[in-house]
């Protein structure tokens, strides 16, 4: 009786279980009662990443420099090319099909995590005692100046956007 299901790494065709092609190879001929499945390796610019019965290999992803992309990892016959973004840019999605500039943290916010090729800048509000007076993709919140250590007194309180202003103590 012909099979209705096949083992792992096999497929059912013409009431027969045929071996799948190994990763990195495509199908050129199904098996028959007398012959095994015939496969052929993918060419240099192509890949197949699973045991398969595909008659065509997939093209490697193109990391388009016009979109700010560059190759992070070159594809093989079994793996796709992995793209990342040029410095100062990050991917717009997990599949990294295009890039956008890193976000800058506005005054009053500091950089919690610097952006990478695949993730944007993460900003955080400067807590009490810290400030940021610039729009930057790198600068963390900086602590207010400690007037006391300079033998000075606070003349103007700091905010999340400005440092304290120190001045000389009043001589009475």
């Amino acid at each position: 009786e012909p099979p209705t299901a096949c083992r792992e790494k096999q497929y059912l065709i013409n009431s027969q279980c045929c071996s799948l092609c190994q990763p990195g190879q495509k199908l050129v001929s199904d098996c028959t009662e007398f012959t095994e499945t015939e496969c052929l390796p993918c060419s240099e610019s192509e890949f197949l990443d699973t045991w398969n019965r595909e008659t065509r290999c997939h093209q490697h992803k193109y990391c388009d420099p016009n979109l700010g992309l560059q190759v992070q990892q070159k594809g093989t016959s079994e793996t796709d090319t992995i793209c990342t973004c040029e410095e100062g840019l990050h991917c717009t999605s997990e599949s990294c099909e295009s890039c956008v500039p890193h976000r800058s943290c506005l005054p009053g916010f500091g950089v919690k995590q610097i952006a990478t090729g695949v993730s944007d800048t993460i900003c955080e509000p400067c807590p009490v005692g810290f400030f940021s007076n610039v729009s930057s993709a790198f600068e963390k919140c900086r602590p207010w100046t400690s007037c006391e250590t300079k033998d000075l007194v606070v003349q103007q309180a700091g905010t999340n956007k400005t440092d304290v202003v120190c001045g000389p103590q009043d001589r009475q």
């Epitope: 092609c21 190994q22 990763p23 990195g24 190879q25 050129v28 001929s29 199904d30 028959t32 007398f34 012959t35 095994e36 015939e38 496969c39 052929l40 390796p41 993918c42 060419s43 240099e44 008659t55 093989t76 016959s77 079994e78």
Partner: antibody, heavy 121, light 113 residues
Framework: QVQLKQSGPGLVQPSQSLSITCTVS????????LHWVRQSPGKGLEWLGV???????DYNAAFMSRLSITKDNSKSQVFFKMNSLQADDTAIYYC???????????????WGQGTSVTVSS | DIVMTQSPSSLAMSVGQKVTMSCKSS????????????LAWYQQRPGQSPKLLIY???TRESGVPDRFLGSGSGTDFTLTISSVQAEDLADYFC?????????FGSGTKLEIK
């Protein structure tokens, strides 16, 4: 024993087409694919295309627009046709049996006697 | 397309001598999943059709004498004839059978002194 016999013209006019038949014995075309290769002093051995045992074809992209490979399994014949021949298509044309060695490995283990083709008016 | 380059283009040897010829491919013929190198060698005696000697770099086709040895990996391959015989007078071609279009080297002509 395995044999591949080729038949076809020796002389082709420029811009005309070339047709060669490869008749095989000792094996079935439903079990083995068949390649076409040509050899010229200027370009050496050039793989032109293959018809796999299931009937699907792969062609060398350089010849795809003017090449056709078909077969008749019941007659054990493979038909090669190339259009628009020019002087630089002058060569010996071979059919060759495909052998599959597993792991995606293919080679040409038996060859026809070759058909010497001259393109000239 | 994968370009195959053979050297030398010709060589002359005496019977009993060891012969080596080289074949280089423009890209690796090593399949990373199964670690096989997809290179074949063919012999073409004068006036005859090519004959398959070796496939997968080093596997001799049945009936091929064991004096023919194939070796190499990646992009560099060698055919060695350990003790050349008069009947080895021929052209030798390497061919990548990694993927289509299958491509051949330009050949090495072996002459017997």
């Amino acid at each position: 024993q395995v044999q591949l016999k080729q038949s076809g013209p020796g002389l082709v006019q420029p811009s005309q087409s070339l047709s060669i038949t490869c008749t095989v014995s000792g094996f079935s075309l439903t079990t083995y694919g068949l390649h076409w290769v040509r050899q010229s002093p200027g370009k050496g051995l050039e793989w032109l295309g293959v018809i796999w045992r299931g009937g699907n074809t792969d062609y060398n992209a350089a010849f795809m627009s003017r090449l056709s490979i078909t077969k008749d399994n019941s007659k054990s014949q493979v038909f090669f046709k190339m259009n628009s021949l020019q002087a630089d298509d002058t060569a010996i044309y071979y059919c060759a049996k495909n052998s599959y060695y597993g792991n995606g490995g293919h080679a040409m283990d038996y060859w026809g006697q070759g058909t010497s083709v001259t393109v000239s008016s | 397309d994968i370009v195959m380059t053979q050297s030398p283009s010709s060589l002359a040897m005496s019977v009993g001598q060891k012969v080596t010829m080289s074949c280089k491919s423009s890209q690796s013929l090593l399949h990373s999943f199964n670690q096989k190198n997809y290179l074949a060698w063919y012999q073409q005696r004068p006036g005859q059709s090519p004959k398959l000697l070796i496939y997968f770099t080093s596997t001799r086709e049945s009936g091929v004498p064991d004096r023919f040895l194939g070796s190499g990996s990646g992009t560099d391959f060698t055919l060695t004839i350990s003790s050349v015989q008069a009947e080895d007078l021929a052209d030798y071609f390497c061919q990548q059978h990694y993927t289509t279009p299958f491509t051949f080297g330009s050949g090495t002509k072996l002459e017997i002194k």
